[in-house]
């Protein structure tokens, strides 16, 4: 058993047919000895009396909010919440598997630009009695500061007959250089706790990684005279890091037809303007990805060819 | 250790085209590394990563754009040197501080140099014949030196004499090649900031 | 989801006793609580005793205090209702239900799985 918070409790229950379970002993945050009773979860059904309870935890309905009176007065709250193991594995039911990019991720990642500011964001099929707390760090075993906010919902989808909830949270690294060459990865740690299961999830990763720039900004076209072919013209997102001469982008340009089986034409550029020729009802996109460090294409911007 | 010497900068776009070959060169060699060890502790999840240049250069520090040192994070660690924008680069002539920027990288590089070729050695002894390194990527390094100028001492190739272990060598040339490959995109990003100024 | 099967109802004398049975299928480690409930013709249904968890906490109405005792085998998870003493009042169609709620045990409408029910009758 190990404190998550004030008086919220985690105990650690090895799950498989006649296990023993944990013994918890809970004690009264109290000077009284005489005349304390135990009640669980708002019931007025006294479990036991006296300054301590011993409570055998199996199974989920073995946690809850433990409250000791006195004389009709709470004296103290203990909230047990389970971690549960099985096969030696801890489980993971509250969050959705993403595969993105491989099984088994939880928790996915990105930053817009290399200032340490990143966001990650996680789904799950449950709507109610759902809290996430959220922490980070540079490295583990001698850990710099990372400051995260409050896990919001940010998206609600609907997936065949279930509806599926994204929650997301922003961080920023306290002191972040960023021409610096991470040599400790960044770990994001996600305490989840639905009724009265807990579980956690992490996640760690160089912001390097993790890169993908906002769209190209800008985009505009320019007819080249006695010529099917346009000039494309584009800027750096506004968000991406600065100075833009150290921190290059590279482009792709794509003219795609109204139907997505025409052929693409696509050129790469690290420029930030390109000739192509436009065809009817064609529209034109571009994307950046950083020029030296091939993590992810941004999103595409997008005008049509008319 | 003796600071190399600087000499005129013949411009810079040949030492941007040569950087530019050089991380091209390294993620190639980093990717076969990864195929041909693909059952090595060899992605980037999975080894520690080493710099072999920590406390003998400072690349990072040293290369810093201009617009970058009011940022105190990225100054905390040591007297910084940064490049200088102004004249000096319209003129070709060399300023003080990008001589410590340019004369760090060109030390990075010999410092990999030397681990790279004791590296190919040791691997080239090895019955498995798994892998060795790209001769292209030797060549560049030697070029972009070159393209650097400076003139520097010459460090001896390290010999050893006992049996290599090719596992701990496969595991360290994947560590190597990581680190190689972040310190070429510093080498990169530099080159191009330094065109552009 | 949770499968709940009730067995061991029947007809049985005033003062007999009866042993009821629910077997539990499915996600039941989901479970906070289950329970006993009944519903005799024309009369809303009523709680009869809730085991919480694996036996922290037992709940029973006054009517059947100290006549009924709830129970339960984790390792076949089981549920049993032993009932002594049993009245003519005490005829009614029993429901086992599981509930993943912490709170309002006691009450029917916060309970999500039941089982079909199997009936008792008190009767010479």
């Known amino acids: 058993i190990w404190e998550l918070k004030k008086d919220v409790y985690v105990v650690e229950l090895d799950w498989y047919p006649d296990a023993p379970g944990e013994m918890v002993v809970l004690t009264c945050d109290t000077p009284e000895e005489d005349g304390i009773t135990w009640t669980l979860d708002q019931s007025s059904e006294v479990l036991g009396s006296g300054k301590t309870l011993t409570i055998q935890v199996k199974e989920f309905g073995d946690a809850g909010q433990y409250t000791c009176h006195k004389g009709g007065e709470v004296l103290s709250h203990s909230l047990l919440l389970l971690h549960k193991k099985e096969d030696g594995i801890w489980s993971t039911d509250i969050l959705k598997d993403q595969k993105e990019p491989k099984n088994k991720t939880f928790l996915r990642c990105e930053a817009k630009n290399y200032s340490g500011r990143f966001t990650c964001w996680w789904l799950t099929t449950i709507s109610t009695d759902l809290t996430f707390s959220v922490k980070s760090s540079r490295g583990s075993s001698d850990p710099q500061g990372v400051t995260c906010g409050a896990a919001t919902l940010s998206a609600e989808r609907v997936r065949g007959d279930n509806k599926e909830y994204e929650y997301s949270v922003e961080c920023q690294e306290d002191s972040a250089c960023p021409a610096a060459e991470e040599s400790l990865p960044i770990e994001v740690m996600v305490d989840a706790v639905h009724k009265l299961k807990y579980e956690n999830y992490t996640s760690s990763f160089f912001i390097r990684d993790i890169i993908k720039p906002d769209p190209p900004k800008n985009l505009q076209l320019k007819p080249l005279k006695n010529s099917r072919q346009v000039e494309v013209s584009w800027e750096y997102p506004d968000t991406w890091s600065t100075p833009h001469s150290y921190f290059s982008l590279t482009f792709c340009v794509q003219v795609q037809g109204k139907s997505k089986r025409e052929k693409k034409d696509r050129v790469f550029t690290d420029k930030t303007s390109a000739t192509v020729i436009c065809r009817k009802n064609a529209s034109i996109s571009v994307r950046a990805q950083d020029r030296y460090y091939s993590s992810s294409w941004s999103e595409w911007a997008s005008v049509p060819c008319s | 250790r003796n600071l190399p010497v600087a000499t005129p900068d013949p411009g810079m776009f040949p030492c941007l085209h040569h950087s530019q070959n050089l991380l091209r060169a390294v993620s190639n060699m980093l990717q076969k590394a990864r195929q041909t060890l693909e059952f090595y502790p060899c992605t980037s999840e999975e080894i520690d990563h080493e710099d072999i240049t920590k406390d003998k250069t400072s690349t990072v520090e040293a290369c810093l754009p201009l617009e970058l040192t009011k940022n105190e994070s990225c100054l905390n660690s040591r007297e910084t040197s940064f490049i200088t924008n102004g004249s000096c680069l319209a003129s070709r002539k060399t300023s003080f501080m990008m001589a410590l920027c340019l004369s760090s990288i060109y030390e990075d590089l010999k410092m990999y140099q030397v681990e790279f070729k004791t590296m190919n050695a040791k691997l080239l002894m090895d019955p498995k014949r798994q892998i060795f390194l790209d001769q292209n990527m030797l060549a560049v390094i030697d070029e972009l030196m070159q393209a650097l100028n400076f003139n520097s001492e010459t460090v001896p190739q390290k010999s050893s004499l006992e049996e290599p272990d090719f596992y701990k060598t496969k595991i360290k040339l994947c560590i190597l090649l990581h680190a190689f490959r972040i310190r070429a995109v510093t080498i990169d990003r530099v080159m191009s900031y330094l065109n552009a100024s | 989801e949770v499968q709940l099967v009730e067995s061991g109802g029947g007809l049985v004398q005033p003062g007999g006793s009866l042993r009821l049975s629910c077997a539990a299928s499915?996600?039941?480690?989901?479970?906070?609580?289950m329970g006993w409930f009944r519903q005799a013709p024309g009369k809303e249904r009523e709680f009869v005793a809730v085991?919480?968890?694996?036996?922290?906490?037992?709940y029973y109405p006054d009517s059947v205090k100290g006549r009924f005792t709830i129970s339960k085998d984790s390792s076949k998870n089981t549920v049993y209702l032993q009932m002594n003493s049993l009245r003519a009042e005490d005829t009614a169609v029993y429901y086992c239900?599981?509930?993943?709620?912490?709170?309002?045990?006691?009450?029917?409408?916060?309970?999500?799985?039941w089982g079909q029910g199997t009936q008792v009758t008190v009767s010479s």
């Open positions: 239900a599981a509930t993943t709620n912490r709170f309002k045990n006691t009450d029917y409408t916060t309970y999500d799985y």
């Open positions: 499915g996600r039941t480690f989901e479970t906070i609580a």
């Open positions: 085991i919480r968890g694996s036996g922290v906490a037992t």
